[in-house]
């Protein structure tokens, strides 16, 4: 679809005569009829296949034609066509004299024609005007013409329809040849496909408008390149959606079971060495001078009564020092200069000679101790109470005051919260310092294993030969993805070696 445009520029009829030679009275009031038809080697009579147009009276005898409009007529004249421009044409222009206002052919005098010209030739679609001048015996017509495409039509023959749009069906403008030119942010044959945010993951992300990155189920992050771990995953990560691969030191389906209490909680004090001894269980090995479950209690080095023979102990920064009573010497006053003759045994202790009288030993009555029976027995000295229990002397005996959560003569027993079997669904109960903990079987979770969850069917490593295990959370089953060379539901059979069945 396009328009043949004809711009009439100047008409000269100096003598003011008709084609018949008769003069116009008072002058030739001139209007034009234009016929555009398909190319003919000799212009033939017959229909104006490409269209016709008439002008109003444009002037008298000789005149220039204004560019825009004159007397209601348009200049350039428009001859629209709704087919592919063939590149060739025939053009016939007639100048007529109109004595009155009625320009219909039947209303004109029989010899009203002033002049008639015909041209034929090639004409390509384009913006440039072709200038032409046709001269007859008495008249001259100067004009120019061109063919341009109608709105939304493009190409060498105005045959390509392209209408710019910015809606659901496309986002583009049209190039001069009619090809689409996508608006920024759009791509595809019809520019319907948005260009997602730069870096948006090709598979895991998508967009409905440019510079957007919407994540498919199981993915997150600005570029949809981060997987979403299994719902409830506490201390774990994923490489594909809904996985829960535990961080170091954590276990269980949701990686919420602490396997490294030492690292995560640092319970041992005063530089003690911590050893994991099970789930939420640990043992502290204290440095010298400290005691207690968490080595939180500072010990005096004299508390162990290292001085013998009635020596008195003095604490020092780098240890202790024994002040020996007369007759004794040595680091711990362990060497004696006395014999039984010196009556060295106190509190009714009886003396026995040793090494031919070079030494002696005291046999102490009950409740007294020491190399000279100089000390009343302190039954707590050996720190018999376990788990941080406090030792109390009670006359001839002693007792331990236990910390909460411990019992027994020496506080050696945990108070058993597990006695009443609090773990549901066959969970295993563990006594802890401040309570208990349930280790749940596969498929259960919660503090008391009371919550039904998906079984991590892969937890038992059912796949052989380094196959990848995938858990189907909807059916609590596993699927093995076999490496090259292995087959079978667990990838247990090498390819080419049939399984050996027992029958």
């Amino acid at each position: 679809s396009g328009v043949f445009q004809l711009q009439l520029q100047e008409f000269i009829n100096e003598r003011g005569v008709l084609a018949s030679g008769r003069p116009c009275e008072p002058g030739c009031r001139t209007f034009f009829r234009v016929c555009l038809k398909h190319f003919q080697a000799v212009v033939s009579p017959g229909p104006c296949t490409f269209g016709t147009v008439s002008t109003p009276v444009l002037g008298t005898n000789s005149f220039a034609v204004r560019d825009d409009s004159s007397g209601g007529g348009r200049n350039p004249l428009q001859l629209p066509f709704n087919f592919t421009w063939p590149g060739t044409f025939s053009l016939i222009i007639e100048a007529w004299h109109a004595p009155g206002d009625d320009l219909r052919p039947e209303a004109l005098p029989p010899d009203a024609l002033i002049s008639k010209i015909a041209i034929q030739g090639s004409l390509a679609v384009g913006q440039n005007w072709l200038l032409d001048e046709q001269t007859s015996t008495l008249t001259r017509l100067r004009y120019s013409y061109r063919v341009i495409c109608s709105d939304n039509y493009y190409g060498d023959n105005c045959s390509r329809l392209c209408k710019k749009r910015n809606d659901h069906f496309g986002h583009y403008v049209c190039q001069p040849d009619g090809n689409l030119s996508c608006l920024p942010g759009w791509t595809g044959e019809y520019c319907q496909q948005p260009i997602c945010l730069s870096g948006c993951h090709e598979q895991n992300g998508y967009c409905s408008k440019p510079a957007e990155c919407l994540c498919r189920p199981g993915w997150q992050g600005r570029l949809c390149n981060e997987c979403i771990p299994h719902n409830g995953c506490r201390h774990g990560t994923c490489s594909t959606p809904w996985q829960c691969t535990c961080d170091e030191g954590w276990g269980g389906l949701f990686c919420d079971q602490d396997l490294n209490y030492c690292t995560h909680h640092s319970p041992c004090k005063n530089g003690a060495t911590c050893s994991n001894s099970g789930q939420r269980s640990y043992t502290c090995t204290c440095r010298p001078g400290y005691t207690g479950v968490d080595c939180e209690l500072e010990l005096s080095e004299c508390d162990s009564n290292p001085c013998r023979n009635g020596g008195s102990c003095k604490d020092q920064e780098d240890g202790y020092h024994c002040l020996c009573p007369p007759g004794y010497y040595g680091l711990h006053c362990e060497h004696s200069t006395l014999s039984c003759a010196d009556s060295p045994c106190f509190n009714g202790g009886s003396c026995r000679e040793r090494n031919q009288g070079a030494n002696y030993a005291c046999e102490c009555p009950p409740n007294f101790t020491g190399s000279n029976c100089e000390k009343k027995v302190d039954r707590c000295t050996s720190n018999p109470c376990a788990n941080g229990g406090q030792c109390l002397n009670r006359g001839p005996s002693r007792m331990c005051r236990c910390r909460p959560g411990f019992t027994g003569t020496y506080c050696e027993l945990h108070v058993s919260d597990c006695a009443r079997n609090p773990c549901a669904h066959g969970g295993t109960c563990h006594d802890l310092e401040n309570g208990l903990m349930c280790t749940c079987p596969a498929g259960f979770s919660g503090r008391r294993c009371e919550v039904r969850t998906s079984i991590d069917a892969c937890a038992s490593s059912p796949c052989f030969n380094r196959a990848t295990c995938y858990t189907d959370l909807s059916t609590d089953t596993f699927v093995c993805n076999c490496p090259y060379g292995f087959v079978g539901s667990r990838c247990e059979f090498p390819v080419g070696l049939p399984p050996s069945f027992p029958w």
Partner: antibody
């Protein structure tokens, strides 16, 4: 009113020439084309060709080319057809008819001229 | 050349009845959506008279009972109610290509 008046009947010997006239009136002769059509006795119509009066361009039926010539005199609004080397099968009524560029077709015809070729 | 074939060669129709004449071209006579087809009526001793141009348009002063239809290669002239003055020979003619050619004619008579 529109009229096309043709010259009278002609009797010619084989090998001779004949020139028929067609005088137009009642319309702008120059704007139109003049066709010539042959009708042999008891036969149908056969198109010979046309002339454009405004620029004297002609278009002939190949069958008659070389023996026929169209001319026009715009000052007298008359068109002519000359047929040469006459043969007996040229015996026919020859019509002129006007035509135009806006496809009304051959809407007005002359009364016809009978040309008899006989030795 | 484009050959125009008319049928029937002759046709006898009662007064007031419909008469239909067909014309077939050896190739399409359409160009740019226009059919370059005309119908003429010729009465004895008279020149032809234009009835229909561009396949379906009536010529000046032609009665409404004459109508034309068709496109491409097949065309029809219809006289809806035959009158006595319609006795004549009817010709189709194409003007798409030089040489312009006529059909052989159909003679219409009163039955």
């Amino acid at each position: 009113q529109v009229q096309l008046v043709q010259s009278g009947a002609e009797v010619k010997k084989p090998g001779a020439s004949v020139k028929i006239s067609c005088k137009a009136s009642g319309y702008s002769f120059t704007a139109y084309y003049i066709h010539w059509v042959k009708q042999a006795p008891g036969q149908g119509l056969e198109w010979i060709g046309y002339i454009a009066n405004y620029n004297r361009a002609t278009n002939y039926n190949q069958k008659f080319k070389g023996r026929v010539t169209f001319t026009t005199d715009t000052s007298t609004s008359t068109a002519y057809m000359e047929l040469r080397s006459l043969r007996s099968d040229d015996t026919a009524v020859y019509y002129c008819a006007r035509d135009y560029d806006y496809d009304v077709g051959m809407d007005y015809w002359g009364q016809g001229t009978l040309v008899t070729v006989s030795s | 050349d484009i050959v125009m074939t008319q049928s029937p060669d002759s046709l006898a129709v009662s007064l007031g009845e419909r008469a239909t004449i067909s014309c077939r071209a050896s190739e399409s006579v359409d160009n740019y959506g226009i059919s370059f087809m005309k119908w003429f009526q010729q009465k004895p001793g008279q020149p032809p008279k234009l009835l229909i141009y561009a396949a379906s348009n009536q010529g000046s002063g032609v009665p409404d009972r004459f109508s034309g239809s068709g496109s491409g290669t097949d065309f029809t002239l219809t006289i809806s109610s035959l009158q006595a003055e319609d006795v004549a020979v009817y010709y189709c003619q194409q003007s798409k290509e030089v040489p312009w050619t006529f059909g052989g004619g159909t003679k219409v008579e009163i039955k």
